[in-house]
Amino acid sequence: HTVELNNMFGQIQSPGYPDSYPSDSEVTWNITVPEGFRIKLYFMHFNLESSYLCEYDYVKVETEEQVLATFCGRETTDTEQTPGQEVVFSPGSFMSITFRSDFSNEERFTGFDAHYMAVDVDECTEREDEELSCDHYCHNYIGGYYCSCRFGYLLHTDNRTCRVECSDNVYTQRTGVITSPDFPNPYPKSSECFYTIELEEGFMVSLQFEDIFDIEDHPEVPCPYDYIKIKAGPKVLGPFCGEKAPEPINTESHSVQILFRSDNSGENQGWRLSYRATGNECPDPELPVHGKIEPLQATYSFKDQVLISCDTGYKVLKDNVEMDTFQIECLKDGTWSNRIPTCKIADCGAPAELKHGLITFSTRNNLTTYKSEIQYSCQQPYYKMLHNITGVYTCSAQGVWMNEVLGRSQPTCLPVCGQPSRSLPNLVKRIIGGRNAEPGLFPWQALIVVEDTSRVPNDKWFGSGALLSESWILTAAHVLRSQRRDNTVTPVSKEHVTVYLGLHDVRDKSGAVNSSAAQVVLHPDFNIQNYNHDIALVQLREPVPLGPHVMPICLPSPEPEGPEPHMLGLVAGWGISNPNVTVDEIISSGTRTLSDVLQYVKLPVVPYAECKTSYESRSGNYSVTENMFCAGYYEGGKDTCLGDSGGAFVILDDLSQRWVAQGLVSWGGPEECGSKQVYGVYTKVSNYVDWLWEQMGSPQGLGDLQVER
């Protein structure tokens, strides 16, 4: 009888085991395990009747197709075989074991005890058949296996072969190289590659197969496995395969499709082709006078481009438009896209006017073409050129006026500072104790009039200032502070400020320049209790024209020391020139200034310690800070006074021979102006140079409005 076994393991014993088996007996055990497994069989006990070639009793192990082993006896001899330690493996998932005993047994034989189990088949090492083995990588697992592919490949639907995705190859360049995937390594299986050469209409593509050509073929049937096909317009060329490459192909089309197909077997190197596109030829372009053409070629065909440029100093002229270069292109009909332009000499045109300056032509006939020269100069003596450059400009090849220092930038005419057209006198007689100034002696002197009409009654006062540039006046902060609020610094409204420049006699303002304020800037740290940081700026609404009576003063270099003791300086102002005049008398007289004609006085700088001590010895909160210095005489008699506030204390700089604003009239007291040992206190301007430039917007060349030490 037959026993069907489907378990993954089990035990098989001869009938009656461990007793002797009966005679004339036949039993078959059919063992079936799942696909991907094989059966392992081994015996723990074996004792059968011996016979020549196991004719009598035996155990036969077989599959559907073959007998794997026949066992009998008790021990292996020449003619019979016992299993002993031998293990029997089925090639597949099925094994049949048949036990047979003949009609008689001379002795008592105990039979056999066998065990079986399902064991995994390692398909990856055992598959020899190309049709079944993995193309790239094989992965075994218990009961089966699977395949995978190298990077860039895709597993085919047969789950075995590796193909590539190669249907999106579009070539738009005029020349190129196309190869089978992985060339010169074997191309992938089960793949369908699609290549498109797509060029502009007017081109014709020619193909040339190169190097190796190796596509799987068949001796009788043309290209049944792998092949290459070429479609150009209506024409289809191919299929091509084998080891002989096709001859060069002129497709006569601008659009070419190449199909390459491989089946699931074979190991062939593939192919490589180069393509190039040709088009109609255009005539050789004519070289313009003073011009050149790039690139220079023997012939020019469709889509070739040439760049026309001109010699240095010349410009390409096309349709009355000047340009640096011009490009033309060979069209598909064999003509150029445009006519060849001409080359025209570069012209810089009329040079730009220079504010406060003049232009002189160095070239005859006032020429403005390439290599012509002009010279800028500034209106002297009131303006000078920034950076002290020559002012010579040459017409460049680009058609731009160029200077070797400034390039294409225009020069700047900056006001000349600290150089009055009338030189200041060296000796000044013993404002108080001062004398009348002559017109043009203090061209930086400004009269600042503040008239607050926003309250009843209208408030009006004045002070002095010093011109720093065409648009800025330097003065003391207390001149521009409204006294309406105590303990707070409220600047007067810019609408209430008028500045007079070039003024000599306040009774005759006709020759003066008057300007309103665009901005009033008080130092943010100005302290009304001790007048520390007593400095301010007024920006004029319009820049003032400079002349003999209106010129700026220079700023000092930023040094904390300030002017040296005993140096002599000048101060001018329309302040009290007579100490016996009271404010009441001035106000009731209707003239709000205290002296009609500008006064000036020469005063020495007082050593800081001496001045500080002189004020500390007085009762009261008088502090001479490091932002102040003092000037005046111990014996008195000469001083600045009310109304001189904000005026510049100027010292002649030895090196540059220019006058520098070292101080601003700030305060003094408590005794009358000009009293013995009452020094005038001045704001030390050198401590504020950086702040001043920050407010005014630092010009490129500070050196022209600032004296450097």
Epitope: V450, P457, N458, D459, K460, W461, H478, Q483, R484, R485, D486, N487, T488, T490, I528, Q529, N530, Y531, V583, D584, I586, I587, S619, G620, N621, Y622, L642, W667, G669, P670
Partner: antibody, heavy 116, light 112 residues
Framework: QIQLVQSGPELKKPGETVKISCKAS????????MSWVRQAPGKGLKWMGW????????TYADDFKGRFAFSLETSARTPYLQINNLKNEDTATYFC?????????WGQGTSVTVSS | DVLMTQTPLTLSVTIGQPASISCKSS???????????LNWLLQRPGQSPKRLIY???KLDSGVPDRFTGSGSGTDFTLKISRVEAEDLGVYYC?????????FGGGTKLEIK
């Protein structure tokens, strides 16, 4: 230290003129305005107005326009209050105080008596 | 003109006890510059006035910190945390926001 020293007491007849001074010291005079305040006997304080010590421009409260005048002698750091055509009701103590609005330091006061 | 009303007229306080004076204005004292110009001063008997507080709550130098000022708009208060003998006299508030500047009627502080 900051000090405001006023002139001494005044005894005047109606119709006369009085001028009171207030000498300032210990600070930059032109930096602060100067206020004048009246205190009638047994009464409260009344602000009369102020003078801008930099410009010299006076400002008067409505009740003190006409007969009252503020003035300055800047070089002497001294403001003045002048009352013209004195009336009996002008009898009071008059104070100067530093500042147009702050009035942070006060003089000792000047007593003016108007009596026929 | 802005009317300044002080209450009470007289304040009788034991030494060491707190005191509070109110000052109300007929219109807001907040100026266009964002500041409130309300000040307090003390006039001791037979002396000239002395400013104690400016801008509502800022103490003048030398003024003891037992004095505090507070308030905004139209309502202001001066407080003394512990009254001392030297504090007696008449306290005035005044405003410097609206021209002309005006004083309160005064509050007399006397010691019980």
């Amino acid at each position: 230290q900051i000090q405001l020293v006023q002139s001494g007491p005044e005894l005047k007849k109606p119709g006369e003129t009085v001028k009171i001074s207030c000498k300032a010291s210990g600070y930059i005079f032109t930096s602060y305005g100067m206020s004048w305040v009246r205190q009638a006997p047994g009464k409260g304080l009344k602000w009369m107005g102020w003078i801008n010590t930099y410009s010299g421009v006076p400002t008067y409260a409505d009740d003190f326009k006409g007969r009252f005048a503020f003035s300055l002698e800047t070089s002497a750091r001294t403001p003045y209050l002048q009352i013209n055509n004195l009336k009996n009701e002008d009898t009071a103590t008059y104070f100067c105080a530093r500042g147009g609005e702050a009035m942070d330091y006060w003089g000792q006061g000047t007593s003016v008596t108007v009596s026929s | 003109d802005v009317l300044m009303t002080q209450t009470p007229l007289t304040l009788s306080v034991t030494i060491g006890q707190p005191a509070s004076i109110s000052c109300k204005s007929s219109q807001s004292l907040l100026d266009s510059d964002g500041k409130t110009y309300l000040n307090w001063l003390l006039q001791r008997p037979g002396q000239s006035p002395k400013r104690l507080i400016y801008l509502v709550s800022k103490l003048d130098s030398g003024v003891p910190d037992r004095f505090t000022g507070s308030g905004s708009g139209t309502d202001f208060t001066l407080k003394i945390s512990r009254v001392e003998a030297e504090d007696l006299g008449v306290y005035y508030c005044w405003q410097g926001t609206h021209f002309p500047w005006t004083f309160g009627g005064g509050t007399k502080l006397e010691i019980k």
